[in-house]
């Protein structure tokens, strides 16, 4: 995690960047032209409920999954997302070990589930903020 506490404005800037990156990474993975993504509603939030860091991404929960899928993506964007998530990781809890499924179909589902969840979560929050401010 980071050595110093990030300011709220810095956190927001990283979140906005992650929102754009996650969408691009998803498009890259699907070899997709820019278009409307199916929105997976009703998924667990990717944001922390920690009163110490309100509005911050729940990095400690997301990082292990991104670290697990990153080698399969072979994409600089995923490495950069991991770097940014690391900056937002204020919890010093031991990291959960996440392993990739060995079955090809299950691996594809696993990767796409993580990418869509993260991208949709950030997108949903951005829309929510846009409507409320």
């Amino acid at each position: 995690g980071p050595i110093y506490q990030l300011q709220p404005k810095e956190i927001q800037a990283i979140i906005v960047e992650l929102q754009n990156l996650s969408k691009k990474l998803l498009d890259d993975y699907l070899n997709k032209e820019k278009g409307v993504q199916k929105f997976d509603s009703d998924l667990p939030s990717c944001f922390t409920s920690d009163s110490q860091a309100p509005g911050n991404i729940n990095s400690s929960a997301i990082l292990p999954y991104f670290k697990a899928i990153s080698p399969s993506l072979n994409n600089d964007k995923s490495l950069y997302i991991i770097e940014q998530l690391d900056k937002l990781n204020f919890q010093n809890a031991p990291e959960t070990e996440v392993s990739m499924p060995t079955d090809n179909f299950e691996r594809k589902r696993f990767i796409l589930t993580i990418l869509r969840w993260f991208s949709n979560c950030l997108e949903h929050r951005a829309q929510h903020h846009h409507h409320h401010h």
Partner: antibody, heavy 118, light 113 residues
């Protein structure tokens, strides 16, 4: 909008083979798997198998592995299912259906009615 | 293979009545990564192809009327139609998408009295 176009009907002789087509439009063909299902008259649905158009990875229901062969043509966004050594038991409606692997099968073709008769 | 069991096989109800049908799987369909059950419900009207109603056991597909509700988790699932309309005459199938082969239930035929 998403469309999966299938020929309405095929009539073939017993012992012959047939190649059923499913032309996809309205979405990125390689971003979704394609499923095939069989439905005999008045019966339920049977899952035949699925193919990933991006790399042609295939998974079959073991019941159909010697009967069906799934392929795709990316250039025309078309999925195919070849059925071999046809008998009257193969007479059925065959559906192609788009598979979103995160959620479910979300769009179905209209189905091709296959009649195997001499 | 995962076995999907649906009940009843058929039922006849009057317009406006509430209907529930059951689907049971031989193993849990809960996907731990997103805590979603890979269970879908399809409606097949006479002479038509199936149409997606519900996915993830309880998420209504866009455009599906609110009278259709899916519930359940693990191995036991239910489709409820809160107030049946004449256009609901159809066969309803559940399908597991947890692992291939993606098996279907045998269907529940809904008839209107």
């Amino acid at each position: 909008q998403v469309q999966l176009q299938q020929p309405g009907a095929e009539l073939v002789r017993p012992g012959a083979s047939v190649k059923l087509s499913c032309k996809a439009s309205g979405y990125t063909f390689t971003s979704y798997w394609m499923n095939w299902a069989k439905q005999r008259p008045g019966q339920g649905l049977e899952w035949i198998g699925m193919i990933d158009p991006s790399d042609s990875e295939i998974h079959y229901n073991q019941v159909f592995k010697d009967k069906a062969t799934l392929t795709v043509d990316k250039s025309s966004s078309t999925a195919y299912m070849q059925l071999s050594s046809l008998t009257s038991e193969d007479s059925a409606v065959y559906y192609c259906a788009r598979q979103d692997i995160v959620t479910t099968v979300d769009y179905w073709g209209q189905g091709t009615t296959l009649t195997v008769s001499s | 293979d995962i076995v999907m069991s649906q009940s009843p096989s058929s039922l006849a109800v009057s317009v406006g009545e509430k209907v529930t049908m059951s689907c049971k799987s031989s193993q849990s369909l809960l996907y731990s990564i997103n805590q979603k059950n890979h269970l879908a419900w399809f409606q097949q009207k006479p002479g038509q192809s199936p149409k997606l109603l519900i996915y993830w056991a309880s998420t209504r597909e866009s455009g599906v009327p609110a009278r259709f509700t899916g519930s359940g988790s693990g191995t036991d699932f239910t489709l409820t139609i809160s107030s049946v309309k004449t256009e609901d005459l159809a066969v309803y199938y559940c399908q597991q998408g947890y692992t291939y082969p993606f098996t279907f239930g045998s269907g529940t035929k809904l008839e209107i009295k």
